[in-house]
């Protein structure tokens, strides 16, 4: 299963901090960066770095501690950029994360200094079963960029 999250300030759940997606092992979390056609908004485009953080980092929307790992950067607002996280128990990659069933993981975005963005937050709850099927569950929509 692929869970698509449109990561931008127009996504009210990310903005409120009550967005929770439930994923199973072998699912994918697809993060879609903000994308603008034409000149973009008058206040400027949203650009930011996305971090996996611990609970205190999620609560305070801070990504500066030793448990705040930079995952991706959304810095090309006029291109189509998407990142994927595979929810797996063991990772073959040194920069990958190992996800444990029953645990919750926290993602936040920290706007770059020149960006118009705000703090956005997402909780990822990892469930127990391994899944094989391919389907998509979006959070937000592309029109919310």
């Amino acid at each position: 299963v692929r869970h698509v999250v449109y990561w931008n300030s127009s996504n009210p759940r990310l903005l409120r901090g009550d967005a929770v997606v439930e994923l199973g092992l072998n699912d994918y979390l697809d993060i879609v960066c903000p994308h603008y056609e034409g000149p973009g908004p008058p206040e400027g485009p949203e650009t930011f770095a996305l971090y996996m953080v611990d609970w205190p980092g999620y609560e305070s929307c801070q990504a500066e501690g030793p448990r705040a790992f930079k995952r991706w950067v959304c810095s090309l607002p006029f291109g189509h950029v998407q990142f994927s996280e595979k929810i797996q128990r063991f990772t073959p990659f040194s920069l990958g994360f190992e996800f444990l069933p029953g645990e919750t993981y926290y993602y936040i975005s920290v706007p770059t200094p020149e960006s118009s963005g705000q703090c956005l937050r997402l909780q990822v709850s990892v469930c127990c079963k391994e899944r094989k099927s391919e389907s998509a569950h979006p959070v937000g929509s592309p029109g919310e960029s």
Epitope: P56, G65, A68, F69
Partner: antibody
Framework: QVQLVQSGAEVKKPGASVKVSCKAS????????IHWVRQAPGQGLEWMGW????????KYNERFKGRVTMTTDTSTSTAYMELRSLRSDDTAVYYC?????????????WGQGTSVTVSS | DIVMTQTPLSLSVTPGQPASISCRSS???????????LYWYLQKPGQSPQLLIY???NRFSGVPDRFSGSGSGTDFTLKISRVEAEDVGVYYC?????????FGGGTKVEIK
């Protein structure tokens, strides 16, 4: 003022388990990580792992995985570290320490230490 | 695991003289978030360790300004500008960038 008070010295036989307690006061217990660090006689410091009392998340040093369990009782603001299958080289002073948050992310307050002796 | 190598192992210093302790890590201590989680602790005889320096160069509250930390990447230094009798003990560097978090082997400072 912040204080971490640990349980008293223990003498254990090889193969046994020990559970050391660390009672916190003077701050909001659920808002700070608690670490466990040990020091063998005449040796340096070794980080064992941490627990976050706010959600009970733990991270253990792989060297102790399977033998160590860190828990907390939020009703009494007490952290516990249990070490199983004790060996003679587990003889050490065991410290609990609080990790302060931003901007430090450092172990700023330490317990007085608990001496654990493993001997047959 | 990250190996933290401290030099020298011991140091005998005349009061009022400077002292310098080096700490070298087996890998860069720059975290993916850009911060460097390198700390210095002092363990006085018969006491628990106490925090001196956090994140490379910041003095913890109550730490005298004769203590300073510097460095980047894999090489770090703790300097005491004028050693006093109360500074005796074992100094440890400590990294929290990579799990497992690891301490250096310690540097024993004594007064001549």
């Amino acid at each position: 003022q912040v204080q971490l008070v640990q349980s008293g010295a223990e003498v254990k036989k090889p193969g046994a388990s020990v559970k050391v307690s660390c009672k916190a006061s003077g701050y909001t217990f659920t808002g700070y990580y608690i670490h466990w660090v040990r020091q063998a006689p005449g040796q340096g410091l070794e980080w064992m792992g941490w627990i976050y009392p706010g959600n009970f998340n733990t991270k253990y040093n792989e060297r102790f995985k399977g033998r160590v369990t860190m828990t907390t009782d939020t009703s009494t603001s007490t952290a516990y570290m249990e070490l199983r299958s004790l060996r003679s080289d587990d003889t050490a002073v065991y410290y609990c320490a609080r990790e302060d948050g931003s901007p430090y992310y450092a172990m700023d307050y330490w317990g007085q230490g608990t001496s654990v002796t493993v001997s047959s | 695991d990250i190996v933290m190598t401290q030099t020298p192992l011991s140091l005998s210093v005349t009061p009022g003289q400077p002292a310098s302790i080096s700490c070298r890590s087996s890998q860069s201590l720059v975290h993916s978030n850009g911060n460097t989680f390198l700390y210095w602790y002092l363990q006085k005889p018969g006491q628990s360790p106490q925090l001196l320096i956090y994140r490379v160069s910041n003095r913890f509250s109550g730490v005298p300004d004769r203590f300073s930390g510097s460095g980047s990447g894999t090489d770090f230094t703790l300097k005491i500008s004028r050693v006093e009798a109360e500074d005796v003990g074992v100094y440890y560097c400590f990294q929290a960038t990579h799990v497992p978090w690891t301490f250096g082997g310690g540097t024993k400072v004594e007064i001549k």
